[in-house]
């Protein structure tokens, strides 16, 4: 299991509306350039086996490859949401550096896997993807954290 | 195809004691939480509790003390037990899986099995 | 805990009618709810969650929207078969575990 108390997120961190706002703003205008609408990243399958207690680690993991194999080499686009919510992204993955899992986190890694091998196998459209569901990785961020 | 089963309803005396019993198939209990939920005759629907995938139990702070929600896995069933039970506990009790999606989703549902308490 | 207060709490409506149901939540729950159909004698059947996502199998005709305290489920022309009553139910986070999980109090869908 995780060691909860650092797999947490402050509610305050998402009581934020400009930033929050911003945030949906940024997918939804990504998702109007995503035309592959059969594939979800972040959904069933992502949690697939993942109890409570390890939700908010898995969530880390994908905060953190959207950060690094997605936003940071798409900072360039979606401006002038990106520049905004790129740095309050990076701030949360920031606070959760020290969550981490005790056991074995193989089943969380091998769904994250699957999410990052989706996005590469899909390119640019991957990307795309990724930040067109912005809205769904900040609400499952929150959900599996505060 | 998936599949939930109710059992173990009926007609028991105030104060008495219940298990209801949810067998599942077409999935595994070790990879999905799964909830109990009961509807009151002529009411709407009232969460119980659930139990995770790691098997821990959370529950309705009405609920706490008198049910317990337990499972199976080797039977592929999900326990109700509920105890000093009441005339207010008749109810047709539900049982349905939790699909986390980012966010708690609950399907699909077991067809119910009905609960009369009454002496 | 959450309180989710639907209107109205039973309506008449006849087939191609367009029906509006409306959930309010005594907090903000951002997208955190679904709604659910449920017929006489059977189960709730899931139909729309994240508060406007579609789940499988569900016709088109069905809608749902809002976000924060406010939320709609639209049907925007009455079939016969959606004579039920509709159920929404919130997830709140964060908060003690004993009120993860609220439902509204249904609006019954009658037929005219």
């Known amino acids: 299991a995780p060691i909860s108390s650092h797999c947490r997120l402050d509610k305050s961190n998402f009581q934020q509306p400009y930033i929050t706002n911003r945030t949906f703003m940024l997918a939804k205008e990504a998702s109007l350039a995503d035309n592959n609408t059969d594939v979800r990243l972040i959904g069933e399958k992502l949690f697939h086996g993942v109890s409570m207690s390890e939700r908010c680690y898995l969530m880390k993991q994908v905060l953190n490859f959207t950060l690094e194999e997605v936003l940071f080499p798409q900072s360039d686009r979606f401006q002038p949401y990106m520049q905004e919510v790129v740095p309050f992204l990076a701030r949360l993955s920031n606070r959760l550096s020290t969550c981490h899992i005790e056991g074995d986190d193989l089943h969380i890694q091998r769904n994250v896997q699957k999410l990052k091998d989706t996005v590469k196998k899909l390119g640019e459209s991957g990307e795309i993807k990724a930040i067109g569901e912005l809205d769904l990785l900040f609400m499952s961020l929150r959900n599996a954290c505060i | 195809e998936v599949q939930l089963v109710e059992s173990g309803g009926g007609l028991v005396q105030p104060g008495g004691s219940l298990r209801l019993s949810c067998a599942v198939s077409g999935f595994s209990l070790s990879s999905y939480a799964m909830i109990w939920v009961r509807q009151a005759p002529g009411k709407g629907l009232e969460w119980i509790g659930i139990i995770d995938i790691d098997a821990s139990t959370y529950y309705a702070s009405w609920a706490k003390g008198r049910f317990t929600i337990s499972r199976d896995s080797s039977k592929n069933t999900v326990y109700l037990q509920m105890n000093s039970l009441r005339a207010e506990d008749t109810a047709v009790y539900y049982c349905?899986?939790?699909?986390?999606?980012?966010?708690?989703?609950?399907?699909?549902w077991g067809q119910g099995t009905l609960v009369t308490v009454s002496s | 805990a959450v309180v989710l207060t639907q209107s109205p709490s039973s309506l008449s409506a006849s087939v191609g009618d367009r029906v509006t149901i409306t959930c309010q939540a005594s907090?903000?729950?951002?997208?955190?709810l679904a709604w659910y159909q449920q017929k006489p004698g059977k189960a709730p059947k899931l139909l729309i969650y994240w508060a406007s996502t579609l789940a499988s199998g569900v016709p088109s005709r069905f809608s749902g929207s809002g976000s924060g305290t406010d939320f709609t489920l639209t049907i925007s022309s009455l079939q016969p078969e959606d004579f039920a009553t509709y159920y929404c139910q919130a997830c709140v986070y964060g908060n003690s575990a004993d009120s993860r999980y609220t439902f509204g109090g249904g609006t019954k869908v009658e037929i005219k």
């Open positions: 349905a899986r939790d699909r986390f999606v980012g966010v708690d989703i609950f399907d699909p």
């Open positions: 907090e903000d729950i951002y997208t955190n």
